[in-house]
């Protein structure tokens, strides 16, 4: 079956958006006017995971290329990469675990755990122009709030 | 060997709460996830909800309101309470645990306890 | 939520029999459905898993089939300890849905 997916771009609670850097990272920056054109466009698939009343199983994508976020152990560190798939068999609906995040919603703006590394989320910097990575920490100065804004197909 | 053993009281009256225990053995409550099934006599079964290894639940939705998964890793214990109960939660209670294969069948559900009935009546 | 239509309800049939049962899902399941053998007064026994696949120390008369949304479960020769009711259950999304169960008596 064809899994369900969503275009959406992510903002984080700074407003800072993603945009790509290099062929696999995402930095997170100000972006303002025709520059909102770089940001990337994830596809978001909903799919099997250890669902819960408050967390969502998503894996993200980036819309129109077979990459995906991904979380593995690097010089044992939970790191966030963008990893490339063969585009015949992605998305489907029971992806790796490293692929897959918990969309956790909480106060209209979002969380994503990875489904790897509980307690391990999706992260920018304060800083401008630095890359997106995989952090072990909530509510210290690295952010891992963000909000959806929907793309339409 | 996988095992898994319901408990609790056989009779609950109206408007209190229902709680039963699921005793595990032959697997880990830290690494699969353990639901709760129940069948009115005579019926079909109903999930009824499941918690995780991790500790995080998912409560069908007819009951969310009423239901309250959790567990004791240490103790092999999970813990099942059904607030305000009514004559139409009279049923055998089941636990089962999840298959929990990531990527091949993780909703699954391949061992059950024996089940235990639970009757409210005044 | 995954409705789960299973059909006969009741069925009655004799030793050596083949006997079929469908499971029809409202959505497609791909290849996540179970099936489960009930006896009175005992809990459910996973038989078969993903559509088709045999649970072990399952005898070989039990098979399944089917993907998508269609489903079936097929006992090839009726044995007196088969006489019981059987369940489909989706496996695919939360919340995980039964079929009403077909009971399966001595004719």
């Known amino acids: 079956a064809p899994v369900r997916s969503l275009n959406c771009t992510l903002r984080d609670s700074q407003q800072k958006s993603l945009v790509m850097s290099g062929p696999y990272e995402l930095k997170a920056l100000h972006l303002q006017g025709q520059d909102m054109e770089q940001q990337v466009v994830f596809s978001m698939s909903f799919v099997q995971g250890e669902e819960s009343n408050d967390k969502i199983p998503v894996a993200l994508g980036l819309k129109e290329k077979n990459l995906y976020l991904s979380c593995v152990l690097k010089d044992d560190k939970p790191t966030l990469q963008l990893e490339s798939v063969d585009p015949k068999n992605y998305p489907k609906k029971k992806m790796e675990k490293r692929f897959v995040f918990n969309k956790i919603e909480i106060n209209n703006k979002l969380e994503f755990e990875s489904a790897q590394f509980p307690n391990w989320y999706i992260s920018t910097s304060q800083a401008e122009n630095m890359p997106v990575f995989l952090g072990g920490t909530k509510g210290g100065q690295d952010i891992t709030d963000f909000t959806m804004q929907f793309v339409s197909s | 060997e996988v095992q898994l053993q319901e408990s609790g009281p056989g009779l609950v009256k109206p408007s209190e709460t229902l709680s039963l225990t699921c005793t595990v053995s032959?697997?880990?409550?830290?690494?699969?996830?353990v639901s709760w099934i129940r069948q009115p006599p005579g019926k079909g079964l109903e999930w009824l909800g499941l918690?995780?290894?991790?500790?995080?639940?998912y409560y069908n939705s007819p009951l969310k309101s009423r239901l309250t998964i959790s567990k004791d890793n240490s103790k092999s214990q999970v813990s099942l309470k059904l607030s305000s109960v009514t004559a139409a939660d009279t049923a055998v209670y089941y636990c089962?645990?999840?298959?929990?294969?990531?990527?091949?069948?993780?909703?699954?559900?391949?061992?059950w306890g024996q089940g235990t009935l639970v009757t409210v009546s005044s | 939520d995954i409705q789960m239509t299973q059909s006969p309800s009741s069925l009655s049939a004799s030793v050596g029999d083949r006997v079929t049962i469908t499971c029809q899902a409202s959505?497609?399941?791909?290849?996540?459905l179970n099936w489960y053998q009930q006896k009175p007064g005992k809990a459910p026994k996973l038989l078969i898993s993903?559509?088709?696949t045999l649970r072990p120390g399952v005898p070989s008369r039990f098979s399944g089939s089917g993907s998508g949304t269609d489903f079936t479960f097929t006992i090839s020769s009726l044995q007196p300890e088969d006489f019981a009711t059987y369940y489909c259950?989706?496996?695919?999304?939360?919340?995980?849905?039964f079929g009403q169960g077909t009971k399966l008596e001595i004719k």
């Open positions: 089962a645990k999840q298959t929990n294969v990531w990527g091949y069948d993780l909703y699954g559900m391949d061992y």
């Open positions: 918690i995780w290894g991790g500790g995080d639940t």
């Open positions: 259950l989706q496996s695919s999304w939360l919340p995980l849905t």
């Open positions: 993903l559509a088709n």
């Open positions: 959505q497609d399941i791909d290849d996540d």
């Open positions: 032959g697997f880990s409550l830290s690494e699969y996830g």
